[in-house]
């Protein structure tokens, strides 16, 4: 039975040209995390594999930095980066857990961070 929950940074906003940390945390399970995929819709941003380490998609290699931890730092933001991001935790023996983050990239100089929220 899948008992874990993923806590994410929730709905977040950031300034154009700036950077943002996408962060998820899996809790309430003893399952082993074998891999975390970061995706934007069906597009791969990066993978952190427990055995092999990080792989960054070619499309993002110049502006994505691994970490902190299993998170991802997205740099040189553009308005086109606005949208949904998913952290997909592959675990054993539970299976797959998915967390969702919505990022809004703002033109203005004021960007407020939204509240954290959980996805069971």
């Amino acid at each position: 039975m899948m008992t874990g929950t993923i806590e994410t940074t929730g709905n977040i906003s950031a300034e154009k040209g700036g950077s943002i940390i996408l962060q998820c945390h899996l809790s309430s399970t003893t399952a082993q995390v074998t891999q975390v995929n970061w995706e934007q819709q069906d597009q791969l941003l990066a993978i952190c594999n427990a055995d092999l380490g990080w792989h960054i998609s070619p499309s993002f290699k110049d502006r994505v930095a691994p970490g902190p931890g299993l998170g991802l730092t997205l740099q040189s933001l553009t308005v086109n980066d606005t949208g949904e991001y998913f952290c997909i935790y592959h675990t054993y023996p539970d299976g797959t857990y998915t967390g969702r983050i919505f990022l809004e990239v703002l033109e203005s100089s004021v960007a407020e961070h939204g509240a954290r929220f959980q996805i069971p």
């Epitope: 074998t34 891999q35 995929n37 597009q43 791969l44 993978i47 594999n49 055995d51 092999l52 380490g53 990080w54 792989h55 960054i56 998609s57 070619p58 499309s59 290699k61 110049d62 592959h90």
Partner: antibody, heavy 120, light 107 residues
Framework: QVQLQQSGGDLMKPGASVKISCKAT????????IEWVKQRPGHGLEWIGE????????YYNEKFKGKAIFTADTSSSTAYMQLSSLTSEDSAVYYC?????????????WGQGTSLTVSS | DIQMTQTTSSLSASLGDRVTISCSAS??????LHWYQQKPDGTVKLLIY???SLHSGVPSRFSGSGSGTDYSLTISNLEPEDIATYYC?????????FGGGTKLEIK
């Protein structure tokens, strides 16, 4: 030494499905992506997509979504590509190649190719 | 998608010649470009990665250069075994895309 041995050529009827195999030897299968590439005369080389064996993570060129499905069997170090609803446009030589996990992005060894002909 | 263009589809040269094959991209690639060789029997090999790095086992007569949108592969002293079709490939953005190929023949 590194080898990617592909299955033999096929003659298939329109509307049918086919599964092409790519058996890897001489390296650690799960440390490399398996890439799939299509070659039609006059159309050059087209990247279909990739799979990371062991993780099940696969990514597709938009053009081939719904046409190709990748799987991999780590116990036999074999990757597969299934092509469905075949038409004459699918007549081509299909290659598998490997790309090291991490930020390498080049296809350093290729299979010998599998020729597929779709004809009634 | 990034379009890769190899304007010369076929090229004829003599043994010992210096041959240059060019490739251009629809947008800047920041040197994120590879070169592959396909022999007449269909065998494909990586020659050059990241614009100018020679893959292991590839003879030093092969070299690559370029920047921005324009790149080239040079064979400094053409040998009979170099008869093949040469493809450039970008990895600046997915999907990976290839040039249409340049077929090299002996005069």
């Amino acid at each position: 030494q590194v080898q990617l041995q592909q299955s033999g050529g096929d003659l298939m009827k329109p509307g049918a499905s086919v599964k092409i195999s790519c058996k890897a030897t001489g390296y650690t299968f799960s440390n490399y992506w398996i890439e799939w590439v299509k070659q039609r005369p006059g159309h050059g080389l087209e990247w279909i997509g990739e799979i990371l064996p062991g993780s099940g993570s696969s990514y597709y060129n938009e053009k081939f979504k719904g046409k190709a499905i990748f799987t991999a069997d780590t116990s036999s170090s074999t990757a597969y590509m299934q092509l469905s609803s075949l038409t004459s446009e699918d007549s081509a030589v299909y290659y598998c190649a490997r790309q090291k996990y991490g930020n390498y992005y080049y296809f350093d060894f290729w299979g010998q190719g599998t020729s597929l002909t779709v004809s009634s | 998608d990034i379009q890769m263009t190899q304007t010369t589809s076929s090229l004829s040269a003599s043994l010992g010649d210096r041959v240059t094959i060019s490739c251009s991209a629809s947008q800047g690639l920041s040197n994120y470009l590879h070169w592959y060789q396909q022999k007449p029997d269909g065998t494909v090999k990586l020659l050059i990665y990241y614009t100018s790095s020679l893959h292991s086992g590839v003879p030093s007569r092969f070299s690559g250069s370029g920047s921005g949108t324009d790149y080239s592969l040079t064979i400094s002293n053409l040998e009979p075994e170099d008869i093949a079709t040469y493809y450039c490939q970008q990895y600046s953005k997915l999907p990976y895309t290839f040039g249409g190929g340049t077929k090299l023949e002996i005069k």
